[in-house]
Interface confidence: medium
């Protein structure tokens, strides 16, 4: 018997589909063999040969079996207030996320197009809702009996110290000063410490998501920046 | 497991009617196109008809065409064989056949029904 | 006559190596379409034995090989046991038919 030869291309039978990692080329109207990750195709298939692939040159990558003529272009390098969390392969695009401090304001399919500083609220205002990757901080005002005294995206609203005998009384962005030696806290409702932002990554344990297989084809149009919220300060 | 059963076979005089079917059962039938195939004693095989998953499509051989119709019911998971005007040469055990869906090929087959033309 | 030719008959001694030929036309194996090869014992359904030339579907002892080139196919069966004595057929789609057509059969006997 003589040597296998290579199944594809062929001609797919109706009611049959061609098997996974082919195509149908129209022109040759055969079931024909993709290029894998990393490789673009460089002759497409007739009736009597199969596709040939090629590797893809720097700074450019295909992420999935594919049979397109050209690799796709990497992004462009990440920006200052970017760090890369993966670099750019000839198997996978380069992806940018926003440093510590700073959230997407306008992402893309893999990572972020557009990074924001977080709001700081000023004192007076404590922290409502962290921020997170892809959400900015909001403040809110301190309610009577607890203040914030620190321009901060972490810091919320902390109860008064209560006094035996007050000697300045606390506002919303000072606390009670006391004259007696034994100061107490009090156990405001609801005054919990809210953890940091994810965005931070001061406390960042989980593993980040696997990148998405599908090819960036859609166009996000760009956003206005968003009014600054009350008591938050002006970067 | 994926399972075909034919029924509907029988003795029948020339030039008259049968209706066969194929219940099946243990895989999406609606992925899968559906095929008869024949065989008349002592001889080979012989294709008789084809569907398309979805019921659009039909094929015929040129020795049934206009005499049987091929069809299927999706939400009852069974296949159609209309035979009309029937012949002594149509005598044969009719197996029902899932095409597979890549690269072709019949994939699985009942256990087949006898069809017997004859005055 | 069938579109598909095949060798009305085959034999061989256990332990050895037999091939069934099926040869086509520009419209069926010519056209890019595959063969697929079918076991049938006696008094049963035959079942699938090969599929898009050297495809075997799980259960199908390595035993048995596919090939095909041009208008020509062939199925290999090594080590050849009793229990393989049964008809064998070829298949194909013909395009100029717009319908599958089948090889007449070879019936393979293990002397």
């Known amino acids: 018997l003589p040597a296998q030869v290579a199944f594809t291309p062929y001609a797919p039978e109706p009611g049959s589909t061609c098997r996974l990692r082919e195509y149908y080329d129209q022109t040759a109207q055969m079931c024909c063999s993709k290029c894998s990750p990393g490789q673009h195709a460089k002759v497409f298939c007739t009736k009597t040969s199969d596709t040939v692939c090629d590797s893809c040159e720097d700074s450019t990558y295909t992420q999935l079996w594919n049979w397109v003529p050209e690799c796709l272009s990497c992004g462009s390098r990440c920006s200052s207030d970017q760090v890369e969390t993966q670099a750019c392969t000839r198997e996978q695009n380069r992806i940018c996320t926003c440093r510590p401090g700073w959230y997407c304001a306008l992402s893309k399919q893999e990572g972020c197009r557009l990074c924001a500083p977080l709001r700081k609220c000023r004192p007076g205002f404590g922290v409502a809702r962290p921020g997170t990757e892809t959400s900015d901080v909001v403040c809110k005002p301190c309610a009577p009996g607890t203040f914030s005294n620190t321009t901060s995206s972490t810091d919320i609203c902390r109860p008064h110290q209560i006094c035996n005998v007050v000697a300045i009384p606390g506002n919303a962005s000072m606390d009670a000063v006391c004259t007696s030696t034994s100061p107490t806290r009090s156990m405001a409702p609801g005054a919990v410490h809210l953890p940091q932002p994810v965005s931070t990554r001061s406390q960042h344990t989980q593993p980040t998501p696997e990148p998405s297989t599908a090819p960036s084809t859609s166009f996000l149009l760009p956003m206005g920046p968003s009014p600054p919220a009350e008591g938050s300060t002006g970067d | 497991q994926v399972q075909l059963l034919e029924s509907g076979g029988g003795l029948v005089q020339p030039g008259g009617s049968l209706r066969l079917s194929c219940a099946a059962s243990?895989?999406?039938?609606?992925?899968?196109?559906m095929t008869w195939v024949r065989q008349a004693p002592g001889k080979g095989l012989e294709w008789v008809s084809g569907?398309?998953?979805?019921?659009?499509?039909?094929f015929y051989a040129d020795s049934v065409k206009g005499r049987f119709t091929i069809s299927r019911d999706n939400s009852k998971n069974t296949l159609y064989l209309q035979m009309n005007s029937l012949r002594a040469e149509d005598t044969a055990v009719y197996y029902c056949?899932?095409?597979?869906?890549?690269?072709?090929?019949?994939?699985?087959w009942g256990q087949g029904t006898l069809v017997t033309v004859s005055s | 006559q069938s579109v598909l030719t095949q060798p009305p008959s085959v034999s061989g001694a256990p332990g050895q190596r037999v091939t069934i030929s099926c040869t086509g036309s520009?419209?069926?194996?010519?056209?890019?379409?595959?063969v697929h090869w079918y076991q049938q014992l006696p008094g049963t359904a035959p079942k699938l034995l090969i599929h898009g030339n050297t495809n075997r579907p799980s259960g199908v002892p390595d035993r048995f090989s596919g090939f095909k080139s041009g208008t020509s196919a062939s199925l290999a069966i090594t080590g050849l046991q009793a229990e393989d004595e049964a008809d064998y057929y070829c298949q194909s789609y013909d395009s100029s038919l717009s319908g599958w057509v089948f090889g007449g059969g070879t019936k393979l006997t293990v002397l």
């Open positions: 056949a899932r095409q597979s869906q890549y690269v072709g090929g019949f994939d699985y």
């Open positions: 569907i398309s998953g979805d019921g659009a499509a039909t």
């Open positions: 243990g895989f999406s039938f609606t992925s899968y196109a």
């Open positions: 520009s419209s069926n194996f010519g056209a890019g379409y595959g």
